[in-house]
Interface confidence: low
């Protein structure tokens, strides 16, 4: 088992909104849960955008999940990752 590296980034979307993207890479096996949570509760599927779980050429995998949030509310959102029985949460950088 190889645990993922998780990286959260933010980018400007429309005025007053930002897109936050959570990327997991370098993990094995491919089974992973990656999702955005607001106040500790998973966002609905229709408010998140997922990348496919894809091989990265090193025998490991990579994927991402993104959502759009209101600027100023970043502290309410975390990226939740679960892989091979281990889990972690990752905040949005300020």
């Amino acid at each position: 088992t190889v645990p993922p590296m998780v990286n959260v980034t933010r980018s400007e979307a429309s005025e007053g909104n930002i897109t936050v993207t959570c990327r997991a890479s370098g993990f094995y096996p491919w089974n992973i849960t990656l999702s955005w949570r607001q106040d500790g509760v998973s966002l609905s599927h229709d408010t998140q955008q997922w990348g496919d779980v894809l091989p990265d050429g090193n025998g490991t995998y990579q994927t991402w999940v993104a959502t759009r949030i209101c600027q100023g509310e970043e502290q309410r959102f975390t990226c939740y990752m679960e892989h091979s029985g281990n889990h972690s949460t990752h905040p949005v950088p300020s």
Epitope: T21, R23, P29, W30, Q49, W50, G51, D52, V53, L54, P55, D56, G57, G59, W64, A66
Partner: antibody, heavy 118, light 108 residues
Framework: EVQLVQSGAEVKKPGASVKVSCKAS????????IYWVRQAPGQGLEWIGY????????IYNQQFKDRVTITADTSTSTAYLELSSLRSEDTAVYYC???????????WGQGTLVTVSS | EIVLTQSPATLSLSPGERATLSCSAS???????LHWYQQKPGQAPRLLIY???NLASGIPARFSGSGSGTDFTLTISSLEPEDFAVYYC?????????FGQGTKVEIK
């Protein structure tokens, strides 16, 4: 309805370059990768590479890495495949395809025939 | 690179017969990353079965898939005239993504 519409057939001389377009509609363009695959006459399918339009990541089949450029324009929901230094063995139908789950190819363009002939 | 070998190269059968197509991988593949496509002359391939055994949208139930590890099978329980085509397996578990060389199902 998901649709991938490719540009028309091309005839090129050896050593030239060709650029094939693939316009996507019926879904959020940045939600799925665009794969490129080619099929030589009477032959099987060969994966060239893919682009993830959302984060701009591009991964190539090493066999094509030196001669292929894959790009995407999210403003027009269009992906492009450019192949340079063409040779006769590049004569093939080039397909774009949308990525489905677990790296499959769930929707396909109609194909673009590229003929390389002197 | 994972090499997929399909057998037989050609399968000659009559409508109503059962077709069994094999796909053998040079290395073990997670069943979640093995897919099947159908291609008719002059047309683009279309996704038939994904993740070894799941029917793609609009694909009739006479198609089924099974297998694990290195050996996978596509079965057509009773061939219809429109099923005569070339079938490809594909793996998405490691780069480069690869296809089998195809099995042509032709009318006997």
């Amino acid at each position: 309805e998901v649709q991938l519409v490719q540009s028309g057939a091309e005839v090129k001389k050896p050593g030239a370059s060709v650029k094939v377009s693939c316009k996507a509609s019926g879904y959020a363009f940045t939600s799925n990768n665009i794969y490129w695959v080619r099929q030589a006459p009477g032959q099987g399918l060969e994966w060239i590479g893919y682009i993830d339009p959302y984060i701009g990541r591009i991964i190539y089949n090493q066999q094509f890495k030196d001669r292929v450029t894959i790009t995407a324009d999210t403003s027009t929901s269009t992906a492009y495949l450019e192949l340079s230094s063409l040779r006769s063995e590049d004569t093939a139908v080039y397909y774009c395809s949308r990525s489905g789950e677990r790296s499959n190819f769930d929707y396909w363009g109609q194909g673009t025939l590229v003929t390389v002939s002197s | 690179e994972i090499v997929l070998t399909q057998s037989p190269a050609t399968l000659s059968l009559s409508p109503g017969e059962r077709a069994t197509l094999s796909c053998s991988a040079s290395s073990s593949i997670s069943s979640n990353y093995l897919h099947w496509y159908q291609q008719k002359p002059g047309q683009a391939p279309r996704l038939l079965i994904y993740r070894t055994s799941n029917l793609a949208s609009g694909i009739p139930a006479r198609f089924s898939g099974s297998g694990s590890g290195t050996d996978f099978t596509l079965t057509i329980s009773s061939l219809e005239p429109e099923d005569f085509a070339v079938y490809y397996c594909q793996q998405g578990g490691s780069l480069p993504l690869t296809f089998g060389q195809g099995t042509k199902v032709e009318i006997k």
